[in-house]
Interface confidence: medium
Amino acid sequence: MKVLQEPTCVSDYMSISTCEWKMNGPTNCSTELRLLYQLVFLLSEAHTCIPENNGGAGCVCHLLMDDVVSADNYTLDLWAGQQLLWKGSFKPSEHVKPRAPGNLTVHTNVSDTLLLTWSNPYPPDNYLYNHLTYAVNIWSENDPADFRIYNVTYLEPSLRIAASTLKSGISYRARVRAWAQCYNTTWSEWSPSTKWHNSYREPFEQH
């Protein structure tokens, strides 16, 4: 049994880091493998992660972490029974993938303005709480070409757009994702999408 693709890990910078790797053949990850991880710090204890299958030869492990600070460094040991298959380390702050925003809501009752709001996925005491920026994706269910991205570079988790920038009388969907420049993170996954029917009063034409 050998590791074909070494584990790569990303952290949500809150409580979970996710590590993925590939074996050289079909593997029952949860019965055959264990990923041990230990914070390199005073009296920190080793923890064991039981991996799950992620495709035939792929494995994924969700490492639970009490808290994360930028200095944290973890040792990682991948075991198959008594055999050490791979040894490495992981610094969560250098591999951050933020949590996806939640509770995306479209408020359509604000005088021909669409107000999109969502929730910041982090609690206020987390470093990323005040460092997230967002991308909002809006698309038409009827017209695949009607697809747009709005970059929200301020901290408030909301976006206002004129309803008239979208077509009237058709249904749209929106979703939002986040990233943090301070840690050069990857983008989060998209939030679940939300749907609304776009309708607004056309202004009377003046002759």
């Epitope: 914070l39 710090f41 005073l42 009296l43 920190s44 204890e45 808290d67 600070v69 200095a71």
Partner: antibody, heavy 123, light 107 residues
């Protein structure tokens, strides 16, 4: 009343051994990480040993590694420091200190200290 | 190892004055710093943790500030019971290290 009382200090010959004890009272001893901090005659403070709440994991810096062993007996609410191969630079006032329960894994500050016990290493 | 440089080594002041003690870390320790007070013949007492949070029962005339490599402890309107020695401690990496101390004496 939260209290830590050290004992076992004294005068010891170079290369000799000594065992310090710290009796804890007024709090749930078994919930806390504990440590020994020493203060030299020049008034410098140094962490010399630490132990987790169940005694399964210990730490000591390179200056005392292999010579000092920290242990605990949660049934007796007592912390110990076994010192061997003592050197003149080990002469100090030894404090038993409780690590605060607040914060995350890096929050290693000490919220309760004993009065200390003096160890003098003579040639 | 991270070195903690405390200044001044000693300081004379009068009751009612305001004094500031500083601690410099040899590398970034974020806010992982505590301040202790030690009176003559007594054990150290925790004053401030995480650079600026006052420990329980500590009077509000004490305040901690700073992050990264530069930290300070300020004592407003010195009281007779404030004289003694003050130490900083970083708890960011191992080994944890204390500053050499600042002795605050009555002028």
């Amino acid at each position: 009343d939260v209290k830590l009382v050290e004992s076992g200090g004294g005068l010891v010959k170079l290369g000799g051994s000594l065992k310090l004890s710290c009796a804890a009272s007024g709090f749930t001893f078994s919930s806390y990480y504990m440590s020994w901090v020493r203060q030299t005659p020049e008034k410098r403070l140094e962490l010399v040993a630490a132990i987790n709440s169940n005694g399964g994991s210990t730490y000591s810096p390179d200056t005392v590694k292999g010579r000092f062993t920290i242990s605990r007996d949660n049934a007796k609410n007592t912390l110990y420091l076994q010192m061997s191969s003592l050197k003149s630079e080990d002469t100090a006032l030894y404090y038993c200190a409780r690590r605060s329960l607040l914060g995350n894994h890096r929050d290693w500050y000490f919220d309760v200290w004993g009065a200390g016990t003096t160890v003098t290493v003579s040639s | 190892d991270i070195q903690m440089t405390q200044s001044p080594a000693s300081l004379s002041a009068s009751v009612g004055e305001t004094v500031t003690i500083t601690c410099r870390a040899s590398e970034n320790i974020y806010s992982y710093l505590a301040w202790y007070q030690q009176k003559q013949g007594k054990s150290p007492q925790l004053l401030v943790y995480n650079a600026k949070t006052l420990a329980d029962g500590v009077p509000s005339r004490f305040s901690g500030s700073g992050s990264g490599t530069q930290f300070s402890l300020k004592i407003n309107t010195l009281q007779p019971e404030d004289f003694g020695s003050y130490y900083c401690l970083h708890h960011y990496g191992t080994p944890l290290t204390f500053g050499a101390g600042t002795k605050l004496e009555l002028k």
